[in-house]
């Protein structure tokens, strides 16, 4: 599922925010590494936040992390466990608009 909505009715003509590709769903095996990609572009450069099951993702040293990429953001989970199952959502904002995309990890 993907959604987009305006925060401000007076958008700068130069500003934009685009979800370039819906987030990937992933089915994988225990102990493997999974990567979820949030592909967005915008001006000003968007801030991206990650959520799992409607809650901010909790980073775990050496196991679960997210970082900015040239295309947006990447969430990586190493040593996958059954406890990781759920809905993952990235939310991006450029301060005026918001876009989001959701993927499932099973």
């Amino acid at each position: 599922p993907t959604s987009s909505w305006n925060i401000s009715s007076e958008l700068n003509k130069d500003s934009y925010l685009t979800l370039d590709e819906p987030m990937n769903n992933i089915t994988t095996s225990l102990g493997q590494t999974a990567e979820l990609h949030c592909k967005v572009s915008g001006n000003p450069p968007p801030t991206i936040r990650w959520f799992k099951n409607d809650a901010p993702v909790v980073q775990e040293p050496r196991r679960l992390s997210f970082r900015s990429t040239i295309y947006g953001s990447r969430l990586r989970i190493r040593n996958l466990d059954t406890t990781d199952t759920g809905y993952f959502q990235c939310v991006a904002t450029n301060g005026k608009e918001v876009v989001s995309s959701t993927g499932v990890l099973f």
Epitope: D54, Y87, V104
Partner: antibody
Amino acid sequence: EVQLVESGGGLVQPGGSLRLSCAASGFTFSSYFIHWVRQAPGKGLEWVATIHSYFDGTSYADSVKGRFTISADTSKNTAYLQMNSLRAEDTAVYYCARTRPTGGAFDYWGQGTLVTVSS
Amino acid sequence: DIQMTQSPSSLSASVGDRVTITCRASQSVSSAVAWYQQKPGKAPKLLIYSASSLYSGVPSRFSGSRSGTDFTLTISSLQPEDFATYYCQQAYWSPATFGQGTKVEIK
């Protein structure tokens, strides 16, 4: 309108089998996690099993692993719980429930079906 | 599995009272906690999700909050229809796990 309707409960002897059904309507069945949650008489809620039919993925509570099987028929928008080797401690009301579109909470529940395991 | 320790197990209150129920998670569950209301012979009903978001159609006298791994359900002014059992649930880690329940009875 979203609806979940369970059926198939009843009285069964220890060691016996039963199959519960959860008929869903009002939403795209294959896009959601569907769960079975049970409640023993006078007790709290216990998660039993989960399926996401799009991925054909399942998970189980340790207490039922190897005895219960969750499945789904997307053509019928129905989830099933096949319960084998039933024990007295499996006696409970069994509810099916759906997860919210972005996960987490169970937003819709069925009315429940009672399973009694007794000789 | 994550343990959700709910307290109290029961409480007596009067119509109009402010009621608070708490749940403590055994480890971080972010803000992925939901609260349910259940009446005898009925299925649970979702009240709060994501620790503090009010579910559609739920009266505004219900509210939820989070402080670290402690979660609170508050009923600001208890109504006759609120006498029921309440459960918390963590949904961050699979499997979902529930608190033991709090029965709210008439004083």
